[in-house]
């Protein structure tokens, strides 16, 4: 028996859905009572679901797991996950045994979008040219950690004086903080970009300076 | 007939090497999973190790997980039992298994194995 | 892993009774479960896989019954080759195989 799975990893989104791929060749005259399938972490080694016996016997892995029953027997032994979470990310090995065993690794990938960004100004009045500001570029939610860049108004990147922080949430969302520092000049953009780097999601946000008033 | 025949056990100082061999007969050997089981003196029967028909998948004990290597050579039928960082506690006789669905259905005369400094 | 205790440790019968050799599992492996004949000296039979299954050639003296988590292997009428030390090993979880500590059946 020889066992295939996706070489790329599987990306899926938090709180949706995922099937992480296994298939066989089953030889002619095969039955499901020959089938012994266990999916497991890769890492820990814990189950995560199993078929044996001609008998799905259910998910180990917080009762969100199911396989495809009416696609076994053609080699289908797929498995899907139900509402994913940040901490399913990682590596399933699917083993597959009908007479002989074979195994194979497929890697899933969590992501979240980032939110649209919001721009605070600190100080955000009476503002002159040569003033230093701090602008705070926040987005929220997402995974895995941000790239995030900052740009002038002509598309200069800045790079100096920028503090970026992100913490994650209880269910492993990171929030993003960049810190720019800056000496206003006589008018100015300044643009943040946050990217997810799995799902190449852009989310920009920017503030305009003028004499007065301020533009977000 | 099916026929298993070890080979390569003898006697070897902790912290040594030591390699067997299994010659396979009798059946089409890239067809079934093989295995490794040991036999401590006077003691039961313990599961080492197993290696797919192909050849792509390996399983291991945990007691000799990242010091033994199963591997297998279809084109002269042989398993091989790579047993590196022996231990006292790997004394045993060493038998090859044909498997079939998990269950061994032939096994070999098995070749001992002695840890002893 | 599956833990499988054998009893009784030793059984002692004269030929032509019934022996009656248990196995319990730590948890269900339905009938995922074989049985082993190892006489002495030699090297370990299958008897019996699929918890009732007879292997090839083993005569019908030998059965096996159970599921789940207790196993029997009965001998129906012990003859003098019938003393051993049997082994049962399950493969329900079959990335970590197991085997039961043995039950030796001596001559009475």
């Known amino acids: 028996v020889e066992v295939q799975v996706s070489e790329d990893p599987v990306v899926a989104l938090v709180d949706t859905d995922a099937t992480l791929r296994c298939s066989f060749s089953p030889e002619p005259g095969f039955s499901l009572a020959q089938l012994n399938l266990i999916w497991q972490l890769t890492d820990t080694k814990q189950l995560v679901h199993s078929f044996t016996e001609g008998r799905d016997q259910g998910s180990a892995y917080s009762n969100r797991t199911a396989l495809f029953p009416d696609l076994l027997v053609q080699g289908n032994a797929s498995l899907r996950l139900q509402r994913v979470r940040v901490t399913d990310e990682g590596s399933y090995t699917c083993f597959v045994s009908i007479q002989d065993f074979d195994s194979a690794a497929v890697s899933l990938q969590v992501a979240a979008p980032y939110s649209k960004p919001s721009m605070t100004l600190e100080p955000n009045k009476d503002l002159r040219p040569g003033n230093m500001v701090t602008i705070t570029c926040s987005s929220y939610q997402g995974y895995p950690e941000a790239e995030v860049f900052w740009k002038d108004g002509q598309g200069v990147p800045l790079t100096g004086n920028v503090t970026t922080s992100q913490m994650a949430n209880e269910r492993g969302l990171f929030d993003v903080h960049s810190v720019l520092r800056v000496v206003l000049g006589a008018n100015g953009t300044y643009s943040c970009l946050v990217r997810n780097p799995v799902l190449q999601q852009d989310a920009h946000g920017s503030v305009t300076i003028t004499g007065q008033p301020l533009t977000f | 007939d099916v026929q298993l025949v070890e080979s390569g056990g003898g006697v070897v100082r902790p912290g040594e090497s030591l390699r067997l061999s299994c010659a396979a007969s009798?059946?089409?050997?890239?067809?079934?999973?093989m295995s490794w089981v040991r036999q401590a003196p006077g003691e039961g029967l313990e599961w080492v190790s197993s290696?797919?028909?192909?050849?792509?998948?390996?399983l291991y004990a945990d007691s000799v997980k990242g010091r033994f290597t199963i591997s297998r050579d279809s084109s002269n039928n042989s398993l091989y039992l790579q047993m590196n960082s022996l231990r006292a506690e790997d004394t045993a006789v060493y038998y090859c298994?044909?498997?079939?669905?998990?269950?061994?259905?032939?096994w070999g005369l098995g070749t001992l194995v002695t840890v002893s400094s | 892993e599956i833990v499988l205790t054998q009893s009784p440790g030793t059984l002692t019968l004269s030929p032509g009774e019934r022996a009656t050799l248990s196995c319990r599992a730590s948890?269900?492996?339905?009938?995922?479960l074989a049985w082993y004949q190892q006489r002495p000296g030699q090297t370990p039979r299958l008897l019996i896989y699929?918890?009732?299954s007879r292997a090839t050639g083993i005569p019908d003296r030998f059965s096996g019954s159970g599921s789940g988590t207790e196993f029997t292997l009965t001998i129906s009428s012990l003859q003098s080759e019938d003393f051993a030390v049997y082994y049962c090993?399950?493969?329900?979880?079959?990335?970590?195989?197991?085997f039961g500590g043995g039950t030796k059946v001596e001559i009475k």
């Open positions: 699929g918890a009732n």
């Open positions: 290696i797919s028909g192909s050849g792509g998948s390996t």
């Open positions: 298994a044909k498997a079939r669905n998990n269950f061994f259905d032939y």
């Open positions: 090993q399950q493969y329900y979880d079959w990335l970590t195989i197991t």
């Open positions: 009798g059946f089409t050997f890239s067809s079934y999973a």
């Open positions: 948890r269900s492996i339905l009938t995922s």
